[in-house]
Interface confidence: medium
């Protein structure tokens, strides 16, 4: 790598991948394996991020961009820059201090992370209950009973069962 | 990292409503439920109500069902805070707040904040 | 009313410890957040989940949970950590968030 001759500031020249070497009077030398620099002018090199553990290598670190990661199977990413993982629950399930635990009784979760939230209301848009909510699905609303031709009926399946005491004591 | 810029302070009269902007920098937001928190002068935190984005699904703090309304324009990646029959005691900063893990964490933390928009309500 | 109850105030030393503590029923499901606010700022996120720390949050704020109690602890105090402090959850009917009342630390 040549010296670089800025009068203003002679690490501005040197490019992503390289640092200002003040030991060796300002020359950019490339970064050390495990390292990278994203932006040009930089007198350090950053340490890559190693994905250890509960996270996986999505995109191995080179020497001007950092390594990204993801989770493993089970678990999901939150925070910036996958910063976290956090456990996957099964549909009909929400994370809390405790694990997994099934939605209560007028809630539902149709994905494998985040929380269990109200069944639709259909009556305040002036609907009927078209198919029942369960843990996993929402309920389903149809046309309002005066909506229905004579004779007609809408489908209402069996309430599910309440769940066994899931909310906070 | 996604930023929230919101729109500007606004003086209303008792009894109309006032419409509050939440602009997010990332297209990708509707991957983000997003928060509607206000915080009277003097006083502490209060939460109004959650929007997601991709489905338009909204809840609201029994104290304020009736009054306020969020939607959402995915085309400029903006939520919108409606609040309705306005007294004084809504004189306050209203904050539009996500958490950038993305999705309803369990935890219902938020990490990404609007500056504020200062509402005066006076006759 | 609030669902999470907080001291109104705590004053610490500076370089001493002080913890803070957020109570309500529906801690004993779910992991509180906690926020930092300074006059005129909106809030800060300092903690959530079991000790999590959002990153620029210096490791002398950390978070515990038992029961219906969640704390959160600033071992070190700075003059820079005078602020009010917030908890939030989700309510004890878990649809919906609730924030707590607040505690103004100040740093002697």
């Known amino acids: 790598f040549e010296r670089t001759r800025s009068l203003q500031d002679p690490c501005s020249n040197c490019p992503a991948g390289t640092f200002c070497d003040n030991n060796r009077n300002q020359i950019c030398s490339p970064c050390p394996p495990n390292s990278f620099s994203s932006a040009g002018g930089q007198r350090t090199c950053d340490i890559c991020r190693q994905c250890k553990g509960v996270f996986r290598t999505r995109k191995e670190c080179s020497s001007t961009s950092n390594a990204e990661c993801d989770c493993t199977p089970g678990f999901h990413c939150l925070g910036a820059g996958c910063s976290m993982c956090e456990q996957d629950c099964k549909q009909g399930q929400e994370l809390t201090k405790k694990g997994c635990k099934d939605c209560c009784f007028g809630t539902f979760n149709d994905q494998k992370r985040g929380i269990c939230r109200p069944w639709t209301n259909c009556s305040l848009d002036g609907k009927s209950v078209l198919v029942n909510g369960t843990k996993e699905r929402d309920v389903v609303c149809g046309p309002s009973p005066a909506d229905l031709s004579p004779g007609a009926s809408s489908v209402t399946p069996p309430a599910p069962a309440r769940e066994p005491g899931h909310s906070p004591q | 990292q996604m930023q929230l810029v919101q729109s500007g302070a606004e003086v209303k009269k008792p009894g109309a409503s006032v419409k509050v902007s939440c602009k997010a920098s990332e297209h990708t937001f509707t991957s983000y439920y997003m928060y509607w928190v206000r915080q009277a002068p003097g006083q502490g935190l209060e939460w109004m109500g959650i929007i997601n984005p991709s489905d338009d699904y909204t809840n609201y703090a029994q104290k304020f069902q009736g009054r306020v309304t969020m939607t959402r324009d995915t085309s400029t990646s903006t939520v919108y805070m409606e609040l309705s029959s306005l007294r004084s005691e809504d004189t306050a900063v209203y904050y539009c707040?996500?958490?950038?893990?993305?999705?309803?964490?369990?935890?219902?933390?938020?990490?990404?904040w609007g500056q504020g928009t200062m509402v005066t309500v006076s006759s | 009313s609030s669902e999470l109850t907080q001291d109104p105030a705590v004053s610490v030393a500076s370089g001493q410890t002080v913890r803070i503590t957020c109570q309500g029923d529906s801690l004993r499901r779910y992991y509180a957040g906690w926020y930092q606010q300074k006059p005129g700022q909106a809030p800060v996120l300092v903690i959530f989940g079991k000790n999590n720390r959002p990153s620029g949050i210096p490791d002398r704020f950390s978070g515990s949970s038992s029961g219906n109690t969640a704390s959160l602890t600033i071992t070190g105090a700075q003059a820079e950590d005078e602020a009010d402090y917030y908890c939030?959850?989700?309510?004890?009917?878990?649809?919906?968030?609730?924030f707590g009342t607040g505690t103004k630390v100040t740093v002697l």
């Open positions: 707040a996500s958490f950038n893990g993305g999705g309803n964490s369990v935890f219902g933390a938020l990490d990404i």
């Open positions: 939030n959850s989700r309510d004890s009917s878990g649809n919906h968030y609730v």
